[in-house]
Amino acid sequence: FKVATPYSLYVCPEGQNVTLTCRLLGPVDKGHDVTFYKTWYRSSRGEVQTCSERRPIRNLTFQDLHLHHGGHQAANTSHDLAQRHGLESASDHHGNFSITMRNLTLLDSGLYCCLVVEIRHHHSEHRVHGAMELQVQTGKDAPSNCVVYPSSSQDSENITAA
């Protein structure tokens, strides 16, 4: 399978909410012993391999933001920890996987990575990620709502297997 990033750039005004999205593409193993570990984290642009460095999002680590569920299931982070930080990650039946960030500040600007790991009995079989940039703006040049910029077809299926 692959991870697509429908939008490579999100430009939002301060105080707005934004939902960053990744999508699982291609054949997905639906065996009874297969689950999917999905999470989000921040990274930096200047790396040899995008998304290899893992930084917290609003002090929450990739472990705190993870979902771990079966292939047929929808899921979302229900624990108070994420919601207290204005964050919620979610996954639906159609392969869409997102993180919602509420009340954006300039400090939220940066590179965000989604990670999907196919797990078979607690062991990783396949690992892919996608990257996108969030720019939070303030002042007269800031848009009134979030503006999203589609990925190029090459970027939208950007995949790195570990």
């Epitope: 569920h69 079966g70 607690h122």
Partner: antibody, heavy 122, light 112 residues
Framework: EVQLVESGGDLVKPGGSLKLSCAAS????????MSWVRQTPDKRLEYVAT????????YYPDSVKGRFTISRDNAKTTLYLQMSSLKSEDTAMYYC???????????????WGQGTSVTVSS | DVLMTQTPLSLPVSLGDQASISCRSS???????????LEWYLQKPGQSPKLLIY???NRFSGVPDRFSGSGSGTDFTLKISRVEAEDLGVYYC?????????FGGGTKLEIK
């Protein structure tokens, strides 16, 4: 400090049922897979059940499949083992153990509780 | 099921000596993802097992560097370079590569 405290062990007759609990503290319980491991009177260790962090996946060896059910309540930070149709060979000390992982990829059973004793005898 | 066989059953040592425990699996425990999920645990008298080594040779946090793990495929070894009194107990190897996960029968490290 990671703490796992098992309870619910007892003397039970063959064919009976028992529910074990494992109260977890000192870590974010919902981030980790968990297992139950038992130690028989001859000191052999046997893994009896495992569950992933979200509770969507469980596994049992043939020796307990269909008789034991592992579950978890992430809000209560508690792991459970429901045991039914108990046999004398289920007599053991039962330990809960945390699965040390990264991205859901298993590394080891890094922390164990002190155990709760189950005796199946008529 | 993968059978894990430990030798010796009992290992009498003098304090300060080197100790070596062998663990052999009935089939390769290299997982399809390339990792070998072989661990070593120590159970001291009256206590629960404690993790020493994971993925063949990685020491768990707080484990002294006198403990080392090695091996590949089906043959694995735990070495204790200089045995101390606190090292006494039963050592178990464990494979987490293939379900069901299985333990070795244990090796009792005791004073000679």
């Amino acid at each position: 400090e990671v703490q796992l405290v098992e309870s619910g062990g007892d003397l039970v007759k063959p064919g009976g049922s028992l529910k074990l609990s494992c109260a977890a503290s000192g870590f974010t319980f919902s981030n980790y897979g968990m297992s139950w491991v038992r130690q028989t009177p001859d000191k052999r260790l046997e893994y009896v059940a495992t569950i992933n962090s979200g509770g969507s996946y469980t596994y049992y060896p043939d020796s307990v499949k269909g008789r034991f059910t592992i579950s978890r309540d992430n809000a209560k930070t508690t792991l459970y083992l429901q045991m039914s149709s108990l046999k004398s060979e289920d007599t053991a000390m039962y330990y809960c153990a945390r699965i040390y992982d990264y991205d859901g990829d298993y590394y080891a059973l890094d922390y164990w509780g002190q155990g709760t004793s189950v005796t199946v005898s008529s | 099921d993968v059978l894990m066989t430990q030798t010796p059953l009992s290992l009498p040592v003098s304090l300060g000596d080197q100790a070596s425990i062998s663990c052999r699996s009935s089939q390769s425990i290299v997982h399809t993802n390339g990792n070998t999920y072989l661990e070593w645990y120590l159970q001291k008298p009256g206590q629960s097992p404690k993790l020493l080594i994971y993925k063949v040779s990685n020491r768990f946090s707080g484990v002294p560097d006198r403990f080392s793990g090695s091996g590949s495929g089906t043959d694995f070894t735990l070495k204790i370079s200089r045995v101390e009194a606190e090292d006494l107990g039963v050592y178990y190897c464990f494979q987490g590569s293939h379900v069901p996960w299985t333990f070795g029968g244990g090796t009792k490290l005791e004073i000679k």
